[in-house]
Structure formats: C-alpha cells, structure tokens
Amino acid sequence: QEFHFGPCQVKGVVPQKLWEAFWAVKDTMQAQDNITSARLLQQEVLQNVSDAESCYLVHTLLEFYLKTVFKNYHNRTVEVRTLKSFSTLANNFVLIVSQLQPSQENEMFSIRDSAHRRFLLFRRAFKQLDVEAALTKALGEVDILLTWMQKFYKL
C-alpha cells in the first residue's frame, strides 16, 4: 500500500507511524487550543477534493506545516517528548513532499488554481489568529489532515 494523491505516488510512508507520533502529543496540543469556535482545516478546504487536485493541495499544505508550523513551534517548545513527536511528523512530511511532483502543464491551470484556493482559505484562517494560537490550532488539527490524507492510502 502507498499514498496515491491523484497522479502522484508516495512510497515509504505508513499512516500508522504518523498517527502514533500525533497521538503522543494530541491531548497536550488540543488542551492548549482555547479557540474552539474557529477551525483552520474547515470543510471548504478538504471536502470533495478531486484526485487531480489532491497532489497540489497536499503539497502546499505539508509545505506550510513544515515551513511555518513545525519550524516555529520547534523554536517555542522545550519538552523532549513533544519535540520528538513533531520531528517524526516533520520527517515524514518531508518524505512525502519530496516525492510529490505536481504537473506543471498549462492544462492543469484550473485544477492547480482550485487547490490553491483551498489552501488560501486555510492560510487566511491561520493568519486571523495570533501566532501562538494559530500554531497550537494547526498542530491540534493534524488529526484532521491525517484523516483526509488517509483516504488516498491505497493498494
């Protein structure tokens, strides 16, 4: 089994490993999230994503988590267990992103555009919170991201 994000295949990443890393810090992260009225990975971001779109969307979302979320949170936390879990997630996200090569074809403009719009809704919601709250919420929503990604884990 492997991830099939439309035409993009990802080998060597097992969802179970991602879940285990997340579960180790889930309670801590979600307890720190005081803003229950807002959601970053809202329905409009992840609902009815076509196979063709999925490669672009997972690419931009995971890149954001790597460059903005994990990177900034890493500088703010000192707890070894938390750092270890996020390192596992980050390393696996790097592995996934490195295997994703979304098509650059002009014909894919509308599909790529649709994925970008979904991502921008997520990013807009992230930017509306203060930095600390946004990072905490993004980390607490990794389960939403993993649940969506798991749909693309196929034979």
Partner: antibody, heavy 122, light 113 residues
Framework: EVQLVESGGGLVQPGGSLRLSCVAS????????MSWVRQAPGKGLEWVSF????????YYAESMKGRFTISRDNAKNTLYLQMDSLKSEDTAVYYC???????????????WGQGTQVTVSS | EIVLTQSPSSVTASVGEKVTINCKSS????????????LNWYQQRPGQSPRLLIY???TQESGIPDRFSGSGSTTDFTLTISSVQPEDAAVYYC?????????FGSGTRLEIK
C-alpha cells in the same frame, strides 16, 4: 476600496527593457493571485502573465515567455513585470489585475488598474 | 491553447432593446473537478479599464445591473443585455481561465442608436 496603481511605462527602443510596477491597496495582497493584461492601440485585451499569492508559480503567454518576468514583493504590496528584448508589437497599455477571492471557486480579473502606456519605437 | 470566438464583432441597438453576444470556445472550459465553467465576461467603456460583469459563466458580479446576465456551458456561452441603456455602449469580452495561456475573445462592440 481596492486600488491598483501601475507605473514604469514609457518610450523604449526595440531590444530595450522596462520594469513595470503595480502598487496594491485596500485588500490583503498576499491572499491573491495577480495578473498583467495588455491592450495594443485599437486592439482587444491580451493576457500577459499570472503569479500565485507567494510567487511560487508563474504562467506566461507564449509570445512573452523568456522575455517577460512577473514577480511580486508581498512586503511592499507590489507586483512587477520585467520586460526585456522589447519589440514594437509589445506597444500597449499594460494593466495589472487582481484575482478573485479564494472563497470563489473560479478565477477572474476582479479589479483592474488604470494602466500604464508602453511604447516600443526607434 | 484555447481560442475564444466572439460574435457578432459589432452590434447596434436602440435603448430598451435586447442584445445577445456569443462566445464559442475551441474546447470545454468546464472543470471535471468542480463542474464550474471557467468563463467570464468584461465590459470596457471607451477610455476606461475593463470591469468584470459575469464570472463562472452565469454569476453576476456585485454592483452590476440586473439587465446583464450570462448563460451557457461546455463550449457555448452567451452574454445577454435585456434592455440596453445608453451607458452600455462599450466593447464586451469573454475570457477563459480554464487553462494557460488564459485568453480573451476578440471583443464585441456595442453601439447605441
């Protein structure tokens, strides 16, 4: 209110270069894709180039590939078009245009600047 | 590359008349992913920048008078002005955003009698 103000146009000789700028205000610039569209004297509209919110992806019209470069500086709310190896057929009014809101499913040119005139002539 | 063919190239109408402008695409501009039509309509009055009238083939931009409507799907699209007004004298363009290079139709000039 959304405002797009282009500048940098002028008279340039064939083979020369120009850099157009478009300063945006009235909206969160880095939430939007941006385009350049041009219009030759007495002619219709012609799309030039498109850039995504972070500058990560760019598209160009075939006749401008390799000669024109679109870029943006989100810190300055500014869109650019670097035009090299200019030809007489590049003479036109150049407009910058803002993409639709991310919450809308399809892209369109929702707001336009007033345009800047580029004349390529010897 | 998607080519958009507009017809007629020009039309003259009296105030109150109905005007129809057609736009035919060389290939479908409807996305299989979201079933949306990536076809927009713009108005350009003399000496002015273009302005958006209709997007996604049939959705009216806010602030646009109700007399402007869009219809069609796949490759054939129509802009209708139900009752032409003097301020509607302009050139009208269709535009596709389905695939790059993005493209415009050649325009339809509307003159008022």
């Amino acid at each position: 209110e959304v405002q797009l103000v282009e500048s940098g146009g002028g008279l340039v000789q064939p083979g020369g270069s120009l850099r157009l700028s478009c300063v945006a205000s009235g909206f969160t610039f880095d939430d939007y894709g941006m385009s350049w569209v041009r219009q030759a004297p007495g002619k219709g509209l012609e799309w030039v180039s498109f850039i995504t919110w972070n500058g990560g992806i760019t598209y160009y019209a075939e006749s401008m590939k390799g000669r024109f470069t679109i870029s943006r500086d989100n810190a300055k709310n500014t869109l650019y078009l670097q035009m090299d190896s200019l030809k007489s057929e590049d003479t036109a009014v150049y407009y910058c245009a803002k993409d639709s809101d991310p919450s809308i499913a399809t892209p369109y040119f929702g707001s336009w600047g007033q345009g800047t005139q580029v004349t390529v002539s010897s | 590359e998607i080519v958009l063919t507009q017809s007629p190239s020009s039309v003259t109408a009296s105030v109150g008349e109905k005007v129809t402008i057609n736009c035919k695409s060389s290939q479908s501009v409807v996305s299989g992913s979201n079933q949306k039509s990536y076809l927009n309509w713009y108005q350009q009055r003399p000496g002015q920048s273009p302005r958006l009238l209709i997007y996604s083939a049939s959705t009216q931009e806010s602030g646009i008078p109700d007399r402007f409507s869009g219809s069609g799907s796949t490759t054939d699209f129509t802009l209708t002005i139900s009752s032409v007004q003097p301020e509607d004298a302009a050139v009208y363009y269709c535009q596709q955003a389905y695939s790059a290079p993005l493209s415009f139709g050649s325009g339809t000039r509307l003159e008022i009698k």
